[in-house]
Interface confidence: medium
């Protein structure tokens, strides 16, 4: 008996009623008497809807199901789920009996549309080109997961410093939460586009912000301008200089160094001498290359609080400023793998890998191959705690069912030091223990 | 020397079968997975799928799901790939690879020399 | 799927010029592989790993990058160099290459 479902996935929206198509060709004489109908769950062969010795025996699914009784003795079996909700994704399958049998499985896809994007902007005040700001872009009661993206005013996406987090409710929604780290320029707008890729519904915001404009003096200050990478625990030099005119002495000179988002005092000379470090006497500068127009400041004992912006500010008659980042970095541990269970392990046998890497900074990205280098991107949850100092310890889980050998490695790379801590971990296709025994 | 020889090029008619083979000399032909990539005529490159000889395992691109066959024969060190429902977009250059390296980095460093498939009534 | 998407995808330069291409991934990835195809002949690695030369590939090549952005770069230009180039990875299935960058004669 040939039994016909659409091949694609049946789209329903959170709420509203679907219809898992299903259709028979009946015989000429065929009765409804005759028919035995079974809707189940594809995967748990749970009962969902029957009709069975003539009759509608309803539903076995929460109350939520009918059939489109005055049609099925035209071989309509099609199934009308009501009020669907994120739990009822999955695979449905249509048993029809008459003497011969048939059976075919239609996917239910649930969607839900994310809501337009609320954008919030921190710091929201006093805003200067140079500052750096959080721009926090949230959408609401989305399902599936939603993919994000930010783009500047001209459409140009913009990936650099972009968090994105997406927490489902009890109902399944998911709720998007992207944040993007930025340096301002003189104005721009910024966007975030939420999409469904199911619904293939965009969802955007965004935001224009005009800083005010920084009093510009006529002294040129030059900063570099890539990020000074520090390691924790080293020294760092935050170079910025000057060009002194003929005549000029230190006596003239203003030099302040302080963050750039806090205004925080880092250090300072004035009145020709050096009034020390306001920062945690950390902090120096090179005070016999200053009058040469040397302004630039030495950092101790790097710590990862020490990430951020630092403007360096030069008042002679004039003045000038410039804003120099430093980035902290640390490198990751040689990855521990410990695997559980490790004892009379069999090929089928499900068995979680976790590897570990320690102290790093910043966040480390983790990746999990086989032992001819394929991903292994299936079930992998990756979690990474920041201990006292700022730093890393990252742990990646990687559940997987066993073949008859195989090696299972992880790669945790720095993505500031571009480096990489590896380990791996292979298993016979003998019944075994891990660590192997001496 | 390491090589790939990949067997000669085929004409097809459409809703036909094509069976490329693909004989691996020169290393441990169990060691290695070997993948497919394909090249229509002035496009780029197209993984299809790939096979682990000593396993058996295959992978294949969604895109051919249900088309592609991948096998491999331990005992002559060959692999072959089997299409099925050719048509005319089908028309490419077939080319097996070696994916080669150590933990955690992998590439492919051998290529056969490319198998001309040509699908037309 | 993991996009990779090379720009440019022509390139005319001159024997001598310094030439770098870019491979932008839609998602990060581990590494990037690069190879250098000739009309009528199979791909030929040059640079695994992001940055690791392949045997035999001179030195005026050389790759860098991370997370989404990687680029190979000749540094001068040499008349066997005109070819075509692609990217490739497979942190995440499928394997996928860049759509080739052709490097013409100016």
């Known amino acids: 008996l040939e039994v016909q479902v659409p091949e694609d996935p049946v789209v329903a929206l959170v709420g509203t009623d679907a219809t898992l198509r299903c259709s028979f060709s009946p015989e000429p004489g065929f009765s409804l008497a005759q028919l035995n109908l079974i809707w189940q769950l594809t995967d748990t062969k749970q009962l969902v809807h029957s009709f069975t010795e003539g009759r509608d025996q309803g539903s076995a699914y929460a109350n939520r199901t009918a059939l489109f009784l005055d049609l099925l003795a035209q071989g309509n079996a099609s199934l009308r789920l009501q009020r669907v909700r994120v739990a009822d994704e999955g695979s449905f399958t249509c048993f029809v009996s008459i003497r011969d049998f048939g059976s075919a499985a239609v996917s239910l896809q649930v969607a839900a549309p994310y809501s337009k994007p609320s954008m919030t902007l921190e710091p929201n005040k006093d805003l200067r080109p140079g500052d750096t700001v959080t721009i926090t872009c949230s959408s609401y009661r989305g399902y599936p997961e939603a993919e994000v993206f930010w783009q500047d005013g001209q459409g140009a996406p913009l990936t650099g410093n972009v968090t994105t987090s997406q927490m489902a409710n009890e109902q399944g929604l998911f709720d998007v939460h992207s944040v993007l780290r930025v340096v301002l320029g003189a104005n721009g707008t910024y966007s975030c586009l939420v999409r469904n890729p199911v619904l293939q519904q965009d969802a955007h915001g965004s935001i224009t912000i005009t800083p005010q404009r920084s009093p510009t003096g006529a002294v040129e200050v030059q900063v570099p301008e890539d990020p000074v990478v520090a390691l924790v625990g080293t020294d760092a030099t935050l170079r910025c200089s000057f060009s002194p005119e003929p005549g000029f002495s230190l006596a003239q000179l203003n030099l302040i160094w302080q963050l750039t988002d806090t205004k925080q005092l880092v250090h300072s000379f004035t009145e020709g001498r050096d009034q020390g470090s306001a920062y945690a006497n950390r902090t120096a500068l090179f005070l016999d290359l200053l009058a040469q127009g040397n302004a630039s400041l030495r950092l101790q004992r790097v710590r990862v609080a020490d990430e951020g912006s630092f403007t360096c500010f030069v008042s002679i008659r004039d003045f000038g400023s410039a804003a120099v980042s430093l980035q902290v970095a640390a490198p990751y541990s040689k990855p521990s793998m410990t695997l559980e269970p490790n004892k009379d392990l069999r090929p089928g046998d499900t068995v979680t890998i976790t590897c570990s890497s320690y102290r790093g900074y910043p966040e480390a990205e983790v990746f999990w191959q086989d032992g001819q280098g394929a991903p292994l991107t299936g079930n992998v949850t990756t979690s990474q705690m920041a201990n006292e100092q700022g730093l890393f310890d990252v742990h990646s889980v990687l559940r997987v069912v066993l073949g008859a050998n195989g090696t299972y490695s992880c790669l945790v790379r720095n993505p500031v030091l571009q480096q990489d801590a590896h380990g791996s971990v292979t298993i016979t296709g003998q019944p075994m223990t891990f660590p192997p025994e001496a | 020397e390491v090589q790939l020889v990949q067997s000669g090029a085929e004409v097809k008619k459409p809703g036909s079968s094509v069976k490329v083979s693909c004989k691996a000399s020169?290393?441990?032909?169990?060691?290695?997975?070997i993948h497919w990539v394909r090249q229509a005529p002035g496009q780029g490159l197209e993984w299809m799928g790939y096979i682990n000889p000593n396993s058996r395992n295959t992978d294949y691109a969604q895109k051919f799901q249900g088309r592609v066959t991948l096998t491999a024969d331990k005992s002559t060190s060959t692999a072959y790939m089997e299409l099925s429902s050719l048509r005319s977009e089908d028309t490419a250059v077939y080319y097996c690879?070696?994916?080669?390296?150590?933990?955690?980095?992998?590439?492919?460093?051998?290529w056969g020399q490319g198998t001309t498939v040509t699908v037309s009534s | 799927d993991i996009q990779l998407t090379q720009s440019p995808s022509f390139l005319s330069a001159s024997v001598g010029d310094r030439v770098t291409i870019t491979c932008r991934a839609s998602s990060s990835v581990s590494y990037m592989n690069w190879y250098q195809q000739k009309p009528g002949k199979a791909p030929k690695l040059l640079i695994y790993?992001?940055?690791n030369l392949a045997s035999g590939v001179p030195s005026r090549f050389s790759g860098s990058g991370s997370g989404t952005e990687f680029t190979l770069t000749i540094s001068s230009l040499q008349p066997e160099d005109f070819a075509t180039y692609y990217c490739q990875q497979w942190s995440s299935n499928p394997l996928t290459f860049g759509q080739g960058t052709k490097l013409e004669i100016k």
């Open positions: 020169g290393y441990s032909f169990t060691s290695y997975t």
């Open positions: 690879a070696r994916y080669s390296g150590s933990t955690p980095y992998w590439y492919f460093d051998v």
């Open positions: 790993a992001t940055s």
